[in-house]
């Protein structure tokens, strides 16, 4: 007997798809050897149709796939657009030749069934409504009307015009006539279930003069759509259940052997396993919605179903849509940290991978919010201004060609804890989820700036120092000036007499920034940071206020500004010198063309906006000389 196992008989109808799973013994050799699907000929030869080596025959071109799942010791052959010519004997097997280990599979593809001329065929999906049309002659206009269901030789009444309704059709079947029609009546059966399928007879009148019509009702269970996604990538379930359930609660559930466990619904239920990485978005007023899951894990593979019911839970007789999700562990998406830890007052540098082939794509960072069905408002992007409340403490550093960009958030508070998403306007699979955990600081920060009360006077020289511990000795130190489109690293002191300069006293582990002479436009947030090549590390921020020599009061109270930097950045609204219209951003509409769940960072187009090139002031280094 063969150690390979699969379905011995597969039957379907023309136009359908089949998905044939073959099981093999769990050995290293089996996991890695060639898998094949071949058709048995009369001469005993088995002609390969598709194999895991990449071979695909002409007759399967564009309609078949073979996917190996070594972690399950299975491989799956998917064949679409079946025709009667596909009927035959096949083998699924393992080995370098088609004579190795195999299992015989018989595939039978039938024509769509035909019925006698007087039979009307109704094909409906589970949960939908069917309207059966029953014609009669004028002589039976005032006679009793009925619909019965054939069970063997008997025909059991479902509903009649005397208001009788079979208990199993209670609240689901109605018999009615439309307008002034005198020769036709209708029966509606709603919330169809599989057992409703069968042959129905509608009748007007009694005895030999009765008018009868045959109706064959086929109730289709959902054919799962197959989705193949990489580990750590994202998947979107697009659910279109129809207008009749537009006002009912929607859900996505994951099937187990007994039932279907709700992952998310529009009544606020959400499975903790998907916290921070799921969004449910209504698409329109016709019952369409989508569910996006990011950061796919091996255990996310399985059967999913979306549906609608006032309870937000799966119910028999309500419309559903089904998917089977496969998660490929050989992923192109690199493994990145899923949890990043920080302390209050400190900073985090989060590395976001993206498809290296799309280095010119726009990069974004959003904050996942649990309210309602989940949403993710964009906080920063390569062409999106930093959101209010994050000024001076958030920047995105693009590193073209590296396949990653870095987001730095400093002046951390415990309220920054939560889930964040890295995303681009390119390959939607490359969405990563990071959980940021901010704990109360128990020691002084690694980087400290003096003076903390930073007020510079126009026309004078102003120096500010950043103290760093010895552990950062070998790392590059830099100062950058924060602006709404990034933090531009300041050139070294020999870049020009007027420009800001950086110098470093190694013996006392200090990196200093000098503004000489101070100008009004020098006012703003400055960051001191460390990095190693493209890898960014700790940062700290300070607000430098600029005042006139003649005026006693600075533009902004520097004590308040830097208290915010150290203590409570979420509490204090900072007066900004940036023009009001620069606080609006307009994201590229391609980014979320059909995914409105990720909120736009602004709503007003900004004219003549230069693209943000955070962290690259003309490629100049901020390190000391």
């Amino acid at each position: 007997q063969s150690p390979i196992f699969g379905p011995q008989d597969v039957s379907s109808i023309e136009g359908n798809s089949v998905s044939i799973t073959c099981y093999y013994p769990d050995t290293s050799v089996n996991r890695h050897t060639r898998k094949y699907w071949c058709r048995q000929g009369a001469n005993g030869y088995c002609a390969t149709l598709i194999s895991s080596n990449g071979y695909l025959s002409k007759e399967y071109s564009g309609r078949a796939s073979l996917i190996n799942f070594p972690e399950n010791s299975t491989f799956v052959i998917n064949i679409a657009h079946l025709t009667q010519e596909d009927t035959g004997s096949y083998k699924c097997g393992l080995g370098t030749t088609n004579r190795g280990l195999f299992f015989d599979v018989s595939l039978e593809v039938s024509q769509v069934p035909e019925f006698p001329n007087d039979t009307h065929v109704y094909t409906k999906d589970i949960g939908r409504t069917v309207t059966i049309e029953c014609r009669f002659k004028e002589g039976n206009a005032h006679s009793k009307k009925s619909l019965c269901k054939k069970r063997g030789e008997a025909c059991e009444v479902v509903i009649d015009s005397t208001e009788y309704v079979d208990p199993s059709y209670k609240d689901r079947a109605i018999l009615f006539m439309k307008g002034t029609s005198r020769d036709i009546f209708y029966v509606n059966i709603s919330h169809l279930i599989p057992s409703d399928a069968g042959l129905y007879v509608c009748q007007a009148g009694e005895g030999p003069s009765a008018d009868k019509n045959n109706a064959d009702l086929q109730v289709l269970e959902p054919e799962p759509e197959l989705l193949y996604k990489d580990l750590r990538s994202s998947v979107t379930f697009e659910c279109d259940l129809g207008r009749e359930v537009a006002n009912d609660a929607k859900y996505l559930c994951r099937k187990n052997k007994e039932t279907c466990d709700v992952i998310i619904n529009t009544l606020g239920k959400r499975d903790p396993a998907f916290e921070g990485r799921i969004l449910l978005t209504p698409r329109d007023d016709n019952g369409r919605f989508s569910v996006l899951i990011t950061g796919l894990r091996k255990e996310d593979a399985g059967h999913y179903q979306c549906g609608a019911h006032s309870s937000g839970l799966p119910q028999e007789g309500w419309p559903v849509q089904a998917w089977q999700l496969f998660v490929n562990e050989e992923s192109t998406i690199p493994n990145s940290r899923s949890v990043v830890k920080g302390v209050t007052g400190g900073s985090v540098a989060i590395v976001c991978p993206y498809n290296p082939k799309e280095s010119s794509s726009l990069k974004y960072w959003c904050h996942w919010e649990a309210d309602e069905n989940g949403r993710c408002p964009v906080l920063v992007g390569t062409q999106a201004l930093v959101q209010e409340g994050y000024e001076g403490r958030l920047a995105l550093f693009d590193q073209p060609g590296s396949g990653a960009y870095t987001v730095i958030l400093n002046q951390l508070t415990t309220q920054d804890s939560g889930f964040y998403w890295c995303l681009t306007d390119g390959d939607s699979r490359w969405r990563t989820t990071i959980e940021l955990q901010v704990a109360e600081a128990t020691k002084k920060p690694d980087l400290e700036v003096t003076p903390q009360n930073a007020t510079a006077v126009i026309g004078e020289t102003f120096t500010i120092s950043c103290h760093y511990p010895c552990k950062f000795y070998s790392q590059e130190k830099y100062w950058c000036k924060w602006s709404n489109d990034g933090c531009h690293i300041l050139p070294s002191h020999d870049e020009g007499a007027r420009q800001s300069s950086v110098s470093c006293d190694q013996s006392s582990q200090i990196v200093s920034m000098t503004l000489n002479p101070v100008k009004k436009e020098d006012e703003g947030w400055y960051w001191c940071g460390v990095k190693e090549g493209q890898v960014y590390g700790e940062t700290t921020a300070i607000y430098v206020a600029v005042e006139e020599r003649t005026r006693g009061s600075p533009h902004i109270n520097p004590t308040d500004a830097n208290a915010r930097a150290k203590d409570a950045p979420e509490e204090e609204a900072m007066e900004s010198s940036v023009r009001e219209d620069e606080n609006k951003a307009n994201l590229d509409p391609r980014l979320f063309a059909d995914e409105r769940e990720i909120q736009n960072a602004g709503d007003q187009a900004q004219e003549n906006r230069a693209s943000g090139n955070a962290g690259s002031a003309g490629g100049q280094s901020g390190s000391s000389k």
């Epitope: 008989d9 599989p194 052997k257 279907c260 399985g302």
Partner: nanobody, 126 residues
Framework: EVQLVESGGGLVQAGDSLRLSCAAS????????MGWFRQAPGKEREFVAT??????????YYADFVKGRFTISRDNAKNTVYLQMDSLKPEDTAVYYC?????????????????WGQGTQVTVSS
């Protein structure tokens, strides 16, 4: 909760046929696979046959020892699955159990099935 009721068991001669039925009721969620397992005295319960459906496509799985002799089928309208057993042998004597699941992983695995019937006795005398 799904209830499964088996019927059709009995005492037959070797070489005879029997048809087992399994009726499902009380279902609140569609099942997608129903199958038959058997347990002979002093032995472990073993897989016999399973039928899985997806839309208008059906997949039938059989254990090696019944291939060509047993046929599994279903009547969608009646929520019933049948096991037609031909050319019965004395070694087919066992209690036959019906099982159902909404999600089929490996059809041969007992733990893939959520619901079980009480069983029906099949005795084949020589």
């Amino acid at each position: 909760e799904v209830q499964l009721v088996e019927s059709g068991g009995g005492l037959v001669q070797a070489g005879d046929s029997l048809r087992l039925s399994c009726a499902a009721s009380g279902r609140t969620f569609p099942t997608y696979a129903m199958g038959w397992f058997r347990q002979a005295p002093g032995k472990e319960r073993e897989f016999v046959a399973t039928i899985r459906w997806s839309g208008s496509t059906q997949y039938k799985y059989y254990a090696d020892f019944v291939k060509g002799r047993f046929t599994i089928s279903r009547d969608n309208a009646k929520n019933t699955v049948y096991l037609q057993m031909d050319s019965l042998k004395p070694e087919d004597t066992a209690v036959y159990y019906c099982a159902a699941t909404t999600l089929l992983t490996d059809p041969r695995a007992l733990n893939a099935y959520a619901y079980w019937g009480q069983g029906t006795q099949v005795t084949v005398s020589s």
